[in-house]
């Protein structure tokens, strides 16, 4: 997180840490973690942790490890022979089904999914919270959780920023309605290592709750604007995937 500040896991109890690759995710119920497809495409058996503000190796040993049962990548995510050259991050969303249910508590609890009503349509200027252990101004990886509050911005703002190290022609980068552009204020942004974490917005119908409006996906340059998977467009797929892959006692 660039331009963010120290955060306590108690304020982001849905935050999941993936250690390989170094990334994030969001707990959405006791059996399921939501993340970005690009986080899990190269590792279908990710090790995840919840409930810890610090991901220092010695501290992780004492925190709650989650074991995956299966990874479900959105069928619209294009799997590439050489993922390094990716310019299309459309449908950057995945679900991880856990082997065992997560025990909830003050440092571990799920984030809501967006509702289907127009109340959950984001407007430019709407604020969302991002959190993670990715690159900061000072460190290549944060050991302690960082967070920032960012406004939603028009997609064109993201398009206008020059990609820092283009793996292809600038025109090749794909922008779709499945993406939210956010940031641009005071240099606050997500960055490498924050991928898959939630862009959390206050629930319009219950101010005590947050919902995952977006997932950290990609960006042209850290510290400018970032692109987030628009979770609202995938709620049907999420619900269907969870229903089709739940055990009878969960139903």
């Amino acid at each position: 997180i660039i331009g963010g500040s120290d955060a306590d896991i108690k304020n982001f109890p849905w935050q999941v840490f993936f250690d390989n690759p170094w990334a994030g995710g969001a707990l959405i119920n006791e059996y399921w973690v939501l993340t970005a497809a690009h986080v899990v495409e190269g590792n279908r058996e990710p090790t995840m942790y919840v409930g810890s503000t610090s991901v220092q190796t010695s501290r992780l040993a004492k925190s709650k490890m989650l074991t995956p049962e299966h990874v479900f990548i959105h069928p619209g995510w294009k799997l590439l022979e050489v993922p390094e050259g990716r310019t299309n991050f459309d449908n950057d969303i995945a679900l991880v089904r856990l082997k065992d249910p997560v025990k909830m508590g003050p440092t571990v609890s799920p984030i809501c999914l967006p509702g289907t009503s127009s109340d959950y349509n984001l407007m430019d200027g709407d604020l969302g919270l991002i959190s993670g252990w990715g690159r900061t101004e000072k460190r290549d990886r944060a050991v302690r959780l960082k967070a920032a509050r960012l406004p939603v911005a028009p997609l064109r703002k993201c398009k206008e920023v020059k990609v820092e190290k283009p793996t292809a022609d600038a025109e090749a980068y794909v922008f779709t309605p499945n993406m939210i552009c956010a940031g641009g204020e005071k240099g606050m942004d997500s960055c490498k290592g924050d991928s898959g974490g939630a862009f959390a917005v206050q629930d319009p119908n219950d101010k005590t709750k947050f919902y995952a409006a977006g997932l950290v996906s990609w960006g042209p340059q850290c510290g400018t604007y970032g692109l987030y998977t628009r979770v609202k467009n995938y709620v049907d797929w999420i619900m269907k995937t969870m229903q089709e892959n739940s055990t009878p006692r969960e139903d």
């Epitope: 690759p21 220092q56 390094e84 460190r139 050991v143 190290k165 340059q221």
Partner: antibody, heavy 119, light 111 residues
């Protein structure tokens, strides 16, 4: 298994340039950070700089800012260190190393490349 | 740059005894409640190997006879009981501030 394989020893003339390579296996360099460290004969270790291969973002120690250029090719999972305007002071073993997970250390190292600058 | 001064430059310790190596930083290497001081071991012809990270945490697979302590500017590496295979050069390294810097090294000989 994580491994960093460095290119072979080099003997070069003063004033020339050289490009050393470090090929990773067991992990994708785009998910990581690769550092380079210099060790002169019978001397200590000096940090040269590092690269984020995902976006080419580099940082250098001030004394190596002009001397060294670090690059990476994610398609071949390889990082490079180019050294220019070589002098006898550049005679050393050069190591590439991976930045650790959950601790700010070098957790895996290449075997080192010996560079000898001599006429 | 943060300068790290190691002492002694070399020491000889009898098998089974304690080896103590000191590392002093020219300014604090503490940040966010952690001390960003690490210790490496380097044997002849090999790259360095991480032993201790964040001043006192033992790297996985490293024997418990190695321990680290300290905070701020003063740090110590202890090896007890010393074994034959511990003959090497030991370096402290700070990762709190760019550029990352190393101490000058301490050569440990086993008597």
């Amino acid at each position: 298994e994580v491994k960093l394989q460095q290119s072979g020893a080099e003997l070069v003339r003063p004033g020339a340039s050289v490009k050393l390579s470090c090929t990773a296996s067991g992990f994708n360099i785009k998910d990581d950070y690769i550092h380079w460290v210099k060790q002169r004969p019978e001397q200590g270790l000096e940090w040269i700089g590092r690269i984020d291969p995902a976006d080419g973002h580099t940082k250098y120690a001030p004394k190596f800012q002009v001397k060294a250029t670090i690059t990476a090719d994610t398609s071949s999972n390889t990082a490079y260190l180019q050294l220019s305007s070589l002098t006898s002071e550049d005679t050393a073993v050069y190591y590439c190393a991976r930045y650790g997970y959950g601790r700010e250390v070098f957790d895996y190292w290449g075997q080192g490349t010996t560079l000898t600058v001599s006429s | 740059d943060i300068v790290l001064t190691q002492s002694p430059a070399s020491l000889a310790v009898s098998l089974g005894q304690r080896a103590t190596i000191s590392c002093k930083a020219s300014q604090s290497v503490d940040y966010d409640g952690d001390s960003y001081m690490n210790w490496y071991q380097q044997k002849t012809g090999q790259p360095p190997k991480i032993l201790i990270y964040d001043a006192s945490n033992l790297e996985s697979g490293i024997p418990a006879r190695f321990s680290g302590s300290g905070s701020g500017t003063d740090f110590t590496l202890n090896i007890h009981p010393v074994e034959e295979e511990d003959a090497a050069i030991y370096y402290c390294q700070q990762s709190n501030e760019d550029p990352w810097t190393f101490g000058g090294g301490t050569k440990l000989e086993i008597k």
